[in-house]
Interface confidence: low
């Protein structure tokens, strides 16, 4: 069951998922000048059995002009290992969620993918909040939100996070502070349905998110 609306907006905060529940869809979007190959997958789908989850389908982009430069990247073990270091551990999350049954890791990038990753979350998905750069967590209960089904309707639980002040960036629990931050993160923009997340992947992954559908920018 897809979540009908977006996770709650917290002023001066962004969110991200650390792993994706089975049933989550990721649109196969290509950057400008490229498009999905004809008959290519429209989306990747997190599927699996009781012991293993993975993304079904593979996104492939080809040049809009030549239409014959189809390439696809399958991550090498080293790349996969490197990506694993960007997943954050949390006191509120004793188990690495990405290794939990029924969850998929962040899919590796594919060649010429769009700067925006659009995810479609399902009931049971958890997202984690952090204060944007220049703000710190003044009060923290659980800084997370879960998409739940109640009386036949989906809703997101309210995270207990207040971000305040012009101080050092609050990181996700257990996440090291990046060596250098490019520029201040903008506040989340409200979008009725799609919300996006802007990831700048440096040594660590600093996150900027907006709502229930997610964007990732690879530099």
């Amino acid at each position: 069951e897809l979540c009908d609306d977006d996770p709650p907006e917290i002023p001066h905060a962004t969110f991200k998922a650390m792993a994706y529940k089975e049933g989550t869809m990721l649109n196969c979007e290509c950057k400008r000048g490229f498009r999905r190959i004809k008959s290519g997958s429209l989306y990747m789908l997190c599927t699996g059995n009781s012991s293993h989850s993975s993304w079904d389908n593979q996104c492939q982009c080809t040049s809009s002009a030549t239409r014959n430069t189809t390439k696809q990247v399958t991550p090498q073990p080293e790349e996969q290992k490197e990506r694993k270091t960007t997943e954050m551990q949390s006191p509120m999350q004793p188990v690495d969620q990405a290794s939990l049954p029924g969850h998929c890791r962040e899919p590796p990038p594919w060649e010429n993918e769009a700067t925006e990753r659009i995810y479609h979350f399902v009931v049971g998905q958890m997202v984690y909040y952090q204060c944007v750069q220049g703000y710190r967590a003044l009060h923290r209960g659980p800084a997370e939100s879960v998409c739940k089904m109640t009386h036949g309707k989906t809703r997101w639980t309210q995270p207990q996070l207040i971000c305040t002040g012009e101080m050092e960036t609050s990181q996700f629990p257990g996440e090291e502070k990046p060596q250098a931050s490019p520029e201040g993160r903008p506040e989340s923009e409200t979008s009725c349905l799609v919300t996006t997340t802007d990831f700048q992947i440096q040594t660590e992954m600093a996150a900027t998110m907006e709502t229930s559908i997610f964007t990732t920018e690879y530099q």
Epitope: L2, D4, D5, D6, M25, N27, E29, R35, R36, L42, Y43, I118, H120, C192, L193, V194, T211, S212, I213
Partner: nanobody, 127 residues
């Protein structure tokens, strides 16, 4: 589900132009193909134009091809139909509709493929 509300209709002289807008609410809008249909007095509902969720594909009825342009703004949750060189036979109530199936690669021209509909906006072309 996607809630839809059309606007932009009105009375226009033959040869004139109109831009119809369809405002959508509901976060699934981004992933659904969208279409415009019309119903003239005493006639069946007729397909006008459709656009895919990712704006890759557009489809037009022969009756409006070359005179109309469908577009969408996913950020603003809007679908548009720009109609030029209007003719009296374009007089109808115009409806915006959302495809049943998200992320569909096929842009449908049949009304049965759409399950969310707006209330419609009246377009009257005088000769």
């Amino acid at each position: 589900q996607v809630q839809l509300q059309e606007s932009g209709g009105g009375l226009v002289q033959a040869g004139g132009s109109l831009r119809l807008s369809c405002a959508a609410s509901g976060r699934t809008f981004r992933t659904h193909n969208m279409g415009w249909f019309r119903r003239a007095p005493g006639k069946e509902r007729e397909f006008v134009a459709a656009i895919s969720w990712n704006i890759d594909n557009k489809l037009y009825a022969d009756s409006v091809k070359g005179r109309s342009t469908i577009s969408r703004d996913n950020g603003g949750n809007m679908v548009f139909l720009q109609m030029n060189s209007l003719k009296p036979e374009d007089t109808a109530v115009y409806y915006c509709a959302a495809d049943k199936i998200p992320l569909s690669s096929d842009v449908a021209a049949t009304a049965t493929e759409y399950d969310d509909w707006g209330q419609g906006t009246q377009v009257t072309v005088s000769s």
